[in-house]
């Protein structure tokens, strides 16, 4: 278990317990219960109160991070009396030993890298381990391939993202023979950490008066449809003076992605490149390879 649990309770205890794997808080059921309530308070005094489970003697916290330490609390009224119990959930271990600067990104639609740095006060023999649970909590993914620095795990590569959902819980545990290592946890949205590939199949066709650029939306990990994409086209006249403004054009995603612009013959040599983003986040991909059109003597 990643942390010590300390109970603060009156004489007749509810025996409150917390399972960090399932994020389930449970207590001993009381006869003739008329009211039950559970909640947690974090270090910033934010209160999270989930719905009670059907049996009313447990509740499950969905979207919480625990590494800063939290206090769980259960209130139960029966027809005879009231119960109240607190459960302290500290992040035990030496301060500053937890993994830090944790981040993850999804790329190439089906690969993910997570990286972190060793805690500043972590001993030389520290070892970190990454576990990922999806929002449905049905499955725990253990890191299959660690990235190492002098033998210490400082990153993880995943090439199978089938166990992830739209929001996932990441836990970095630590071990050492010398001292207790604190854990770090984080909730990440896949839509916020995905880096799109640039659009594919970029083509340019010109007639005497116009040029038509076409492209295909990038393959993504997220389930996105055509309206979920925003594109930016960089149409660039070659051999222009340095400092000349590029023409950046914003285009909304469509079933057939195309941009038609006036360009009469004879036309100078131009290049066009395109990048893509989620329309809600505008986290731009890298640019596609530049496609050239027109002629040097235009």
């Amino acid at each position: 278990e990643k942390s010590d649990l300390r109970t603060v309770a009156p004489a007749s205890s509810l025996n409150v317990r917390f399972d960090s794997r399932t994020m389930n808080l449970s207590w001993d059921c009381q006869e003739n219960t008329t009211f039950s309530k559970c909640f947690l308070t974090d270090k910033k005094n934010r209160v999270v109160e989930p719905r009670l489970s059907n049996n009313e003697c447990s509740c499950t916290f969905r979207e919480i991070c625990l590494h800063e330490g939290v206090t769980f609390e259960v209130h139960v009224n029966t027809s005879q009396r009231g119960f109240q119990q607190k459960l302290l959930y500290p992040n035990s271990g030496r301060e500053g030993t937890a993994a830090q600067n944790f981040s993850c990104f999804i790329y190439n639609a089906d690969l993910m890298n997570c990286t972190w740095a060793r805690g500043p006060t972590a001993p030389r023999d520290v070892q970190y381990f990454l576990y990922i649970r999806n929002s449905k909590r049905r499955r725990e993914i253990r890191c299959p391939y660690y990235i190492q620095d002098s033998g210490t795990h400082v990153g993880c590569h995943l090439d199978n993202l089938s166990g992830l959902t739209s929001r996932n819980y990441f836990l970095v545990n630590g071990t050492s023979r010398e001292i207790g290592i604190q854990f770090f946890d984080s909730l990440l949205d896949t839509k916020k950490i995905e880096r799109f590939n640039p659009p594919s199949n970029v083509t340019v066709r010109c007639n005497t008066t116009h040029c038509l650029v076409r492209w295909k939306q990038p393959r993504t990990y997220q389930k996105l449809s055509y309206l979920d994409f925003q594109y930016q086209l960089d149409v660039h006249r070659k051999n222009t003076q340095p400092g000349t403004e590029n023409l950046l054009i914003n285009v909304s995603g469509d079933l057939e992605n195309r941009y038609n612009f006036p360009s009469s013959e004879p036309r100078a040599k131009h290049s066009v490149k395109i990048r893509a983003a989620d329309v809600r986040i505008l986290n731009w991909s890298s640019w596609s390879e530049a496609i050239e059109f027109g002629s040097d003597d235009g």
Partner: antibody, heavy 120, light 111 residues
Framework: QVQLVQSGAEVKKPGASVKVSCKIS????????IHWVRQTPTKGFEWMGG????????VYAQRFQGRVTMTEDTSIDTAYLTLSSLRSDDTAVYYC?????????????WGKGTMVTVSS | QAVLTQPSSVSGAPGQRVTISCTGS?????????VSWYQQLPGTAPKLLIY???KRPSGVPDRFSASKSGTSASLAITGLQADDEADYYC???????????FGGGTKVTVL
């Protein structure tokens, strides 16, 4: 230009079944999610179901569960809606639509609609 | 009874600005799920005007705009024109029904 061409109007007796088709032209059905929505003067628009890429399967609205079947023939880019045990309050215009954006779905474009009349 | 509540009608003179409200609950708009808006001209299929609360698909004039706050959303039409006369519907997703839900529609009349 992507178009959704729906089958013609139908008149059915209570208890019967109806099958409405939706042919996609200008794009491959295998790259799209199709949903079905019906419209009545009394109840307005009612979502019936469609392909959910998260679940990788066709999902149905609870109120139509057991009576509705949605199928796709990607070889001819056609989606089908079958509604059984028809009642008079199933009289409606039935639309197929492409999911243009997920979470939650936004529909664009729509077919022109198929009028289904249930009458004894 | 529609899950999302809209006024049955609004009207305005040409050139004016009209707004249409759409009120939901904590299981749909307030969950929070995004809102889409559609225009339906008489005898035709609906046309998407707005998605992801405030995004316009290509081809939709910027006279149409929308916003969302809490459990409600609104659509604004500025510079009202005669061909804006139509029914307008809001749509979102409802977690308790596990599917798309619609408003009852608002008839916009250009005076």
């Amino acid at each position: 230009q992507v178009q959704l061409v729906q089958s013609g109007a139908e008149v059915k007796k209570p208890g019967a079944s109806v099958k409405v088709s939706c042919k996609i032209s200008g794009h491959s059905l295998s790259e799209l999610s199709i949903h079905w929505v019906r419209q009545t003067p009394t109840k307005g628009f009612e979502w019936m179901g469609g392909f959910d890429p998260e679940e990788n399967e066709i999902v149905y609205a609870q109120r139509f569960q057991g009576r509705v079947t949605m199928t796709e023939d990607t070889s001819i880019d056609t989606a089908y809606l079958t509604l059984s045990s028809l009642r008079s309050d199933d009289t409606a215009v039935y639309y197929c639509a492409i999911v243009g954006s997920f979470s939650p779905p936004a529909y664009r474009p729509w077919g022109k609609g198929t009028m289904v009349t249930v009458s004894s | 009874q529609a899950v999302l509540t809209q006024p049955s009608s609004v009207s305005g003179a040409p050139g004016q600005r009209v707004t249409i409200s759409c009120t939901g609950s904590g299981s749909n708009i307030g969950a929070p799920y995004d809102v889409s808006w559609y225009q339906q001209l008489p005898g035709t299929a609906p046309k998407l005007l707005i998605y992801h609360n405030n995004k316009r698909p290509s081809g939709v004039p910027d006279r149409f705009s929308a916003s969302k706050s809490g459990t409600s959303a609104s659509l604004a039409i500025t510079g009202l024109q005669a061909d804006d006369e139509a029914d307008y519907y809001c749509q979102s997703y409802d977690s308790s029904l596990s599917g798309s839900v619609f408003g009852g529609g608002t008839k916009v009349t250009v005076l």
